[in-house]
């Protein structure tokens, strides 16, 4: 079982839209999937949990902060929009 | 050399049932996602079908669903389209295509086989 | 669903000149996209994926590029193999759509 994320460290302007990939090797056909981020205050936060038939977001992620779920792919990707200052974190896609 | 040859086609009356073939050779079949397209008499291309190379995820566009079933041989290397309810806007050039691994862009297609929904 | 809006449908030129051909999907697809030649009677054949990757076998006179909701492929130095006609696909998610296609025609 493995996760990679392709996307390299990026600074983005704020207002834009960044699109964090993750992709996922696995012989369990419903996996459950994570993401998560760690801020410059080195808090620990859940952001996205997904499977095969439904996602959900932390509080803090209504409105801006979505997932792409290409089962086909095996992609969770995570979808950031508008992205503020205080989104800045390192970003980690588990499951 | 990938390899991927359809067969199945033909005349069928509106609401009747077909099954296409594709038989693959060349590669690991059992290895990789497979995809039913279609290209329309005036040359759209649709796609159709897909299913997981195990087997055990496949999916359809809303215009189909219900009406097509995918599967797969893999003993056999073969890919089918099991179709039904059959509608004159099916009536297409239908070719099987073969995926990269975990990805969705068609890496490989066959030479296609007409099917044809008239009265 | 997503669509896509190919343009222009279709496109006569001299071998030798360079074409531009458009795709527009109606979302970002993060340059999940992918084109395709036909030629007439043939199936189609992979040229370019994720965005701007060509296919193994593709001359490099081949081009592609773009990102968000707007892609093209372009081709240099038009050689007569190359006319026929030409197709953009997403793979953001299913369900998987097509441009409408461009037919390039020797003038």
């Known amino acids: 079982d493995k996760v990679t994320q392709s996307s390299p460290d990026q600074t983005v302007a704020s207002g834009s839209e960044v699109v964090l990939l993750c992709t996922y090797d696995t012989v369990y056909s419903n996996p459950d999937l994570f993401w998560y981020r760690i801020r410059p205050d080195y808090s620990f936060q859940f952001v996205f949990y997904g499977d095969n038939s439904r996602s959900e977001g932390a509080d803090f992620t209504q409105g801006r902060f979505s997932v792409k779920h290409i089962l086909t792919q095996k992609a969770f990707h995570l979808v950031i929009s508008p992205v503020r200052t205080e989104d800045s974190a390192t970003y980690y896609c588990a499951f | 050399e990938v390899k991927l040859v359809e067969s199945g086609g033909g005349l069928v009356q509106p609401g009747g049932s077909l099954k296409l073939s594709c038989a693959a050779s060349g590669f690991t079949f059992s290895s990789y996602a497979m995809s039913w397209v279609r290209q329309t008499p005036e040359k759209r291309l649709e796609w159709v079908a897909y299913?997981?190379?195990?087997?055990?995820?496949?999916y359809y566009p809303d215009t189909v669903e219900g009406r097509f079933t995918i599967s797969r041989d893999n003993a056999k290397n073969t890919l089918y389209l099991q179709m039904s309810s059959l509608k004159s806007e099916d009536t297409a050039m239908y070719y099987c295509?073969?995926?990269?691994?975990?990805?969705?862009?068609?890496?490989?297609w066959g030479q296609g086989t007409l099917v044809t929904v008239s009265a | 669903d997503i669509q896509m809006t190919q343009s222009p449908a279709s496109l006569s030129v001299s071998v030798g000149e360079t074409v531009t051909i458009t795709c527009r999907a109606s979302?970002?697809?993060?340059?999940?996209l992918a084109w395709y030649q036909q030629k007439q009677g043939k199936s189609p054949q992979l040229l370019v994926y994720?965005?701007?990757n060509l296919a193994d076998g593709v001359p490099s006179r081949f081009s592609g590029s773009g990102s968000g909701t707007q892609y093209s492929l372009k081709i240099n130095s038009l050689q007569s193999e190359d006319f026929g006609s030409y197709y953009c696909q997403h793979f953001w998610g299913t369900p998987y759509t097509f441009g409408g296609g461009t037919k390039l025609e020797i003038k």
């Open positions: 295509a073969r995926h990269p691994p975990m990805n969705d862009w068609f890496l490989y």
């Open positions: 994720a965005a701007t």
């Open positions: 299913i997981r190379d195990g087997g055990g995820g496949t």
């Open positions: 979302e970002n697809i993060y340059s999940h």
